[in-house]
C-alpha cells in the first residue's frame, strides 16, 4: 500500500453478454458472524480524509501512550514511529512502556519511493473508540523512514488488517486482528465505512473532520442503506477480489476480463486512488474523456498531475460518467456491480486556488500491480472485511458524496458466466523477488 | 498559417461594458485541440488573465472578474467575444486574445493586442 | 492561491553575457510551468513549456531548467534582441491563472 497514491505512501489482466438480471432475492442475507445492529462506541472512530490517509486512536505500552494509526487493508503489519522525526508531533517511547518486550529482530520494508525499518517487539495495544479490549501485539517500531510519514497528515504509525502472507519480514509474525480474534472473544470480522469530504477543506476544518468508522467485531446497520453483497476473497494475502467486467456510464470496456485483475485486484484502504493495470487505465480514460467531451482538461490533469478548478458550488459533476465494477459473485455465474460518481473519483484539494473556487485532480491513476481499489472506490460504499466467512461486502454508504441526480449504487444480481477465468494465476517465482516494493 | 486580431472601442465610459471581438484565420475555432482566452496587460503593469473558451461553449473564469466577464463563440463567424461589465479606470489595458495550445495548458499564440481606456 | 515570485526585478547586463532569471513558485507547481518573453509594444511569446521543452522557433540560447518550487530560465548569451520582459506562468492549477510579475532585461 504505498505513496503519492498509496498511503501512506504508496498522495501508489467471455462468456454471454452481462446486464441479464436475475429475480433479486427475496430472503435477508444470510446472517453474518459477530454482533449485528448497533456499535455506538466505535462510529466515526476514524478521522482524516482521502488524500491522506484514515486514522484510528489507538494506545501503545503500560502506561498507555496515545497514537493515531492509519488504517491500511494493503499490508500486514503494525508499524508505529518509535523515534523522533519532523513530521511526527509524538511517538511510540518502548523505554516508557513496562510491558514492552523485544523480539530481538529487525524489519525493513522498501517501498518503489521510499521505505521504513525498525526493530520488533510486543506490548499491550488497545482501541479507544474500539471493542474493551487490551491485547498483546508485535510491534514494529520505525526508527528509520524515506518518504513513509506525511507531513501534516497526523498519524505516526500504520496498522496493516491484511494477511499475515503479507507481513513483514515474513508469514511468522502474527498480524494485529489476527492476534486480536485469537486474545479475545470478538469475531472475525470488521467494517469500514471511510467518508470523503466531497469539497476541499482546510486544514483547520480537516483536523476537525470526522472521517468515517472502522466497527471491529461486525457490523453496523446505521452506516449503509440497502442490501450488502458479498465477494469472495479469492486468496488470503492482501484482500483480493476478481472484477467481472468494468463499464463507464454503462458502456462496456470489453475487455478480456483477466486484464481487470492483471495481476491482482485488491481493496486497499491505504491507497488513495482507484488505480487500474496500464491497459484497462488507458481504456478507461479514453472512455471518460469521450464521455465528458463537452469540456476538455489537460493530459495532466488524466496523469493525476495537474488540478482542474471551477467556480465554487458548479462542478460540472453531470459532464463525468459513473464508473461500474462488477465483482464476482457468491453464487455460481452470479456477479453484483459497485458503481462511484466522479463526487468520489474528482478528489478535492484544498489552498491551491482561491476560496472562490473548487479544484480536484482525477484519483483514477495507472498501476502496474494489479487494480486497487482504494479510498476513491471506498468512500462510495460500507465494506465489510467478512475473514471468518473469506469474502468482502458492499453496500451504499450512508455518507458517501453524491448530488441529487446520481447516487453511488450496489446493484445485482446480473448473470456473469466463466467468471473464475477472470482471475490471473501468478507464476510461481522465488518468494525473495515476489515482493519488490507497491508503487 | 493562424493569426488572432482583437477588435473593439479603444474608449469606454466608466459603469460601461466593454466589449471586444477576436477573429480567427488560417484555422479553425472548432479544433478541439484548443481553447481559447483573454488575457491583458494594465499599462506598465503585469499579464492579468481573464478567461478561457472551449468551441463547445464551456468558459472559465478568473475569479476576480467573475460576474462582470463573459466570454462567448460564434463558430460560424470563427470569432470569440469577451465582454466586461462594470468598467472602471483600473480596466484601462492592453487585452490580448490567445490560444491555449500544447494541450490545453500553454497560450502559444497571440494577437497583437488592443488598447482599450476607461474614461469619461 | 499559488503565487510566482520572479527576480530579480531588474536585470542589468551587456550582450553576450548570460542572464539567470529565477521564479519561485509559492507551492509546488509539478513542472507546469511556462517562460514568455515580451517587446515593448508587442505581445507576449512562449519560449518555455513544461519547465524546460523550447517552443517552436526558439533558439536553443534558451533554456528553462527547475521543477517543484524553484525554476530558472537561462539565456547562454544574450543577443541584442533579447533584452525585453519575462514572465513566467504556472499551469498546475488549470485553467492557466497566474503570471509571475515579471523579470526586466536591460542593456547594461
Known amino acids: 500500500t504505498h505513496l503519492g497514491i498509496r498511503l501512506p505512501l504508496r498522495s501508489g489482466l467471455a462468456g454471454p453478454p452481462l446486464g441479464l438480471r436475475l429475480p433479486r432475492e427475496t430472503d435477508e442475507e444470510s446472517e453474518e458472524p459477530g454482533r449485528r445492529g448497533s456499535f455506538v462506541e466505535m462510529v466515526d472512530n476514524l478521522r482524516g480524509k482521502s488524500g491522506q490517509g484514515y486514522y484510528v486512536e489507538m494506545t501503545v505500552g503500560s502506561p498507555p501512550q496515545t497514537l493515531n494509526i492509519l488504517v491500511d487493508t494493503g499490508s500486514s503489519n503494525f508499524a508505529v514511529g518509535a523515534a523522533p522525526h519532523p513530521f511526527l508531533h509524538r511517538y511510540y517511547q518502548r523505554q516508557l512502556s513496562s510491558t514492552y518486550r523485544d523480539l530481538r529482530k529487525g524489519v525493513y520494508v522498501p517501498y518503489t519511493q521510499g521505505k521504513w525499518e525498525g526493530e520488533l517487539g510486543t506490548d499491550l495495544v488497545s482501541i479507544p473508540h474500539g471493542p474493551n479490549v487490551t491485547v498483546r501485539a508485535n510491534i514494529a517500531a520505525i526508527t528509520e523512514s524515506d518518504k513513509f510519514f506525511i507531513n501534516g497528515s497526523n498519524w505516526e504509525g500504520i496498522l496493516g488488517l491484511a494477511y499475515a502472507e503479507i507481513a513483514r519480514p515474513d508469514d511468522s509474525l502474527e498480524p494485529f486482528f489476527d492476534s486480536l480474534v485469537k486474545q479475545t472473544h470478538i469475531p472475525n470480522i470488521f467494517s469500514l465505512q471511510l467518508c470523503g469530504a466531497g469539497f476541499p477543506l482546510n486544514q483547520t476544518e480537516a483536523l476537525a473532520s470526522v472521517g468515517g468508522s472502522m466497527i471491529i467485531g461486525g457490523i453496523d446497520h446505521s452506516l449503509y442503506t440497502g442490501r450488502l453483497w458479498y465477494t469472495p476473497i479469492r486468496r488470503e494475502w492482501y484482500y483480493e477480489v476478481i472484477i467481472v467486467r468494468v463499464e463507464i456510464n454503462g458502456q462496456d470496456l470489453k475487455m478480456d476480463c483477466k486484464e481487470y485483475n492483471y495481476d491482482k485486484s485488491i481493496v486497499d484502504s491505504g491507497t488513495t486512488n482507484l488505480r487500474l493495470p496500464k491497459k484497462v487505465f488507458e481504456a478507461a480514460v479514453k472512455s471518460i474523456k469521450a464521455a465528458s467531451s463537452t469540456e476538455k482538461f489537460p493530459d495532466g490533469f488524466w496523469l493525476g498531475e495537474q488540478l482542474v478548478c471551477w467556480q465554487a458550488g458548479t462542478t460540472p459533476w453531470n459532464i463525468f460518467p459513473v464508473i461500474s465494477l462488477y465483482l464476482m459473485g457468491e453464487v455460481t455465474n452470479q456477479s453484483f456491480r459497485i458503481t462511484i460518481l466522479p463526487q468520489q473519483y474528482l478528489r478535492p484539494v484544498e489552498d491551491v486556488a482561491t476560496s472562490q473556487d473548487d479544484c480536484y485532480k482525477f484519483a483514477v491513476s495507472q498501476s502496474s500491480t494489479g487494480t486497487v481499489m482504494g479510498a476513491v472506490i471506498m468512500e462510495g460504499f460500507y465494506v465489510v472485511f467478512d475473514r471468518a466467512r473469506k469474502r468482502i461486502g458492499f453496500a451504499v454508504s450512508a455518507c458517501h458524496v453524491h448530488d441529487e441526480f446520481r447516487t453511488a449504487a450496489v446493484e445485482g444480481p446480473f448473470v456473469t458466466a466463466d467468471m473464475e477465468d477472470c482471475g490471473y494465476n501468478i507464476p510461481q517465482t522465488d518468494e525473495s523477488t515476489l515482493m519488490t516494493g507497491r508503487a | 498559417q493562424l493569426q488572432l486580431q482583437e477588435s473593439g472601442p479603444g474608449l469606454v465610459k466608466p459603469s460601461e461594458t466593454l466589449s471586444l471581438t477576436c477573429t480567427v484565420s488560417?484555422?479553425?475555432?472548432?479544433?478541439?485541440?484548443?481553447?481559447w482566452g483573454w488575457i491583458r496587460q494594465p499599462p506598465g503593469k503585469g499579464l492579468e488573465w481573464i478567461g478561457n473558451i472551449y468551441y463547445s461553449g464551456s468558459t472559465y473564469y478568473n475569479p476576480s472578474l467573475r460576474g462582470r466577464v463573459t466570454i462567448s463563440v460564434d463558430t460560424s463567424k470563427n470569432q470569440f467575444s469577451l465582454k466586461l461589465s462594470s468598467v472602471t479606470a483600473a480596466d484601462t489595458a492592453v487585452y490580448y486574445c490567445a490560444r491555449l495550445g500544447h494541450g490545453y495548458n500553454y497560450f502559444d499564440l497571440w494577437g497583437r493586442g488592443t488598447l482599450v481606456t476607461v474614461s469619461s | 492561491e499559488i503565487v510566482l515570485t520572479q527576480s530579480p526585478a531588474t536585470l542589468s547586463l551587456s550582450p553576450g553575457e548570460r542572464a539567470t532569471l529565477s521564479c519561485r513558485a509559492s507551492q509546488s507547481v509539478s513542472s507546469y510551468l511556462a517562460w514568455f518573453q515580451q517587446k515593448p509594444g508587442q505581445a507576449p511569446r512562449l519560449l518555455i513549456y513544461d519547465a524546460s521543452n523550447r517552443a517552436t522557433g526558439i533558439p536553443a540560447r534558451f533554456s528553462g531548467s527547475g521543477s517543484g518550487t524553484d525554476f530558472t530560465l537561462t539565456i547562454s548569451s544574450l543577443e541584442p534582441e533579447d533584452f525585453a520582459v519575462y514572465y513566467c506562468?504556472?499551469?498546475?492549477?488549470?485553467?492557466?491563472?497566474?503570471f509571475g510579475g515579471g523579470t526586466k532585461v536591460e542593456i547594461k
Open positions: 506562468q504556472q499551469v498546475y492549477v488549470w485553467p492557466p491563472r497566474t
Open positions: 488560417g484555422g479553425s475555432i472548432s479544433s478541439s485541440s484548443y481553447y
